[in-house]
Interface confidence: low
């Protein structure tokens, strides 16, 4: 699984990567006063997707670039082939305890498939503790808990999202490793569909229990910008989104799910080379604060507000936004201080703990996805042999409703 590192080329000075459009779909006003999104704002959301390119700071050694994105979820460091640390970040799965390494039967032998895996620890992703993720053959991990037709669109950890087909070669495998403190997925000797003559790719994504994410690249046989995105998106980076339930005009009692990507980091694909690595270190978020005082006094770049009824600290832009809106948290927090909540009995107003922000109709259509990759509808399937019940067994236990059937 892990051939010895080959001689990588020196990245040289003047290189780096860009984090593009990191505050996707929200203008500053909306961020500062997160209320219910009106129709005009939704139009604006879809127009805001362009985003900008962030500045890059050069470290003294001129080989490593550090970018702190402007929403401060992660600090990201790129290590070029000549950096000793890039080798240290590679997890040698072959040397790991065999009981902790799994070769995924389906993913190793098929194309455009994805499979749910349960982690042995809670992994904090954008501040949200996740226990299950979905590994895809296409070089990425889907981090969402509601499956839809476009897994490649958002909520991903993508060391190199592309049209990989592990079924092409007898040497290709998708393996994962979980030792309780780190979860590693390795796409090993996988080939690009239609570009098999270019050679095989070997790379991995590591999710650390402290929230760090590492992309390590062992074999990248071609220039990543040359990879065609006509059949499958090509991306490297992180993305997260929240979901909003909107009443459906056709069926009043049903609610349509809209997916809003609120943050994305995109690496410069030209910097993804053999023996390079990227490390994402999480920064504090509002969600980590457990009390009103800690929330309101936090010195984060986020505009944290305390929602008394939910007993939650939030910027209003995270996966719990539906609850934040449903319980009027934006209005509640307006101009209030922590002392104002002292006399209130929050227990009587607390929502049912079983409340799910994702209850309702799960039928997500392309038109309700405010994301910038609508041109390429991905057909990655969650399960290669979903039976008559479709995907019902692959949804989060807290998710109810009719699942989207991806087909097989």
């Amino acid at each position: 699984l892990s051939p010895q590192p080959g001689a990588g080329h020196d990245e040289g000075p003047g290189s780096g990567w860009a984090a593009k459009g990191t505050v996707r779909g929200w203008n500053r006003r909306a961020r500062e006063s997160p209320g219910h999104v009106s129709e005009p704002d939704r139009t604006q959301l879809s127009q805001d997707l362009g985003g900008g390119t962030l500045a890059m700071d050069t470290l003294p050694d001129n080989r490593t670039r550090v970018v702190e994105d402007n929403h401060s979820y992660y600090v990201s460091r790129l290590y070029g082939p000549s950096e000793p640390h890039s080798r240290e970040l590679w997890v040698d799965v072959a040397e790991a305890n065999r009981s902790q390494v799994k070769i995924h039967t389906i993913l190793s032998n098929t194309h455009r498939q994805a499979s749910r895996v349960v982690l042995s620890f809670d992994f904090p992703f954008y501040g949200h503790p996740l226990r299950q993720i979905t590994i895809a053959t296409g070089g990425f991990i889907f981090m969402g808990d509601v499956i839809h037709r476009m897994l490649t669109a958002t909520q991903y950890v993508a060391p190199l999202m592309a049209n990989f087909n592990p079924g092409y070669s007898d040497n290709s495998t998708v393996v994962y490793f979980d030792n309780g403190t780190v979860f590693v997925v390795q796409w090993d000797h996988v080939y690009l569909q239609g570009w098999e003559d270019k050679g095989s790719f070997t790379f991995q994504a590591a999710l650390h229990h402290d929230g760090r994410i590492v992309f390590a690249y062992k074999e990248i046989p071609m220039s990543v910008p040359e990879i065609s995105s006509s059949q499958h998106p090509v991306k490297t980076g992180l993305s997260d989104a929240f979901m909003i339930l909107n009443p459906s005009p056709d069926v009043p009692e049903s609610r349509r799910r809209s997916i809003f990507e609120y943050h994305r980091i995109e690496l410069d694909p030209s910097k993804v080379t053999s023996m390079s690595a990227v490390e994402f270190t999480p920064l504090p978020t509002c969600l980590q604060h457990r009390s009103c005082d800690a929330c309101m006094s936090s010195d984060l770049t986020f505009n944290c507000s305390w929602c008394h009824v939910l007993q939650r600290c939030s910027s209003g832009f995270d996966r719990y936004r539906q609850e934040w809106m449903d319980y009027g948290c934006a209005q509640e927090a307006e101009g209030r201080m922590c002392e104002d909540f002292q006399d209130e009995d929050h227990d009587s107003a607390s929502p049912d703990t079983s409340f799910s922000p994702y209850d309702g109709d799960l039928t997500t259509t392309s038109s309700s996805l405010f994301i910038d990759s609508l041109t390429t509808e991905d057909d990655t399937k969650l399960n290669p042999y979903a039976g008559g019940d479709g995907l019902q067994n692959n949804l989060s236990p807290k998710t109810k409703g009719t699942p989207v059937h991806l087909g097989t």
């Epitope: 799994k102 039967t105 399960n383 042999y385």
Partner: antibody
Amino acid sequence: EVQLLESGGGLVQPGGSLRLSCAASGFTFSSYAMSWVRQAPGKGLEWVSAIYGAGGKTYYADSVKGRFTISRDNSKNTLYLQMNSLRAEDTAVYYCARISHGWGFDVWGQGTLVTVSS
Amino acid sequence: DIQMTQSPSSLSASVGDRVTITCRASQDISNYLNWYQQKPGKAPKLLIYAASSLQSGVPSRFSGSGSGTDFTLTISSLQPEDFATYYCQQSYTYPLTFGQGTKVEIK
């Protein structure tokens, strides 16, 4: 009709070798992954090895790794299991099975008995 | 390796009874689970794949359910030809593993 027919079983001494064959018919053999599953007398089923359609991508149970080799000849629609360094605990009925439906064994041969005894 | 544990190891039932066999995986295997029936001297037969999908040609009295670690095979109304040994098998990761089997006998 889809059929799998094993052959090559028999009595062999410990440390000896045996080669099992499985002739497939009624389906496009090269399109399917194939596997060997065994069953010791009076015991349950034990997966032994698997090989994918193109040949070459192989997997083995720990109990046979390094001793058994699975292979296939797609031109002859035949699956093989080369068994070396046989042990008494390898005594079993060996089934050839087609892998389908998400790695379920949907077609089985009738089995061939391998007895390892001195 | 993923261990598959079936219960009960054997059961006695009468024709027409509703029979339930359970299978537990030592770790989450999503719905990568198959069920087989085997009669003495015969090769196993695939009944259910992907935890709940009925294999072509298998009577509808057989059904499967479950996801994650706990799975169930149900025979809604036991027929004389159903007396056999039943095995579950995970196809989530290598090595592929079977349960120890559940023998269904005539009461």
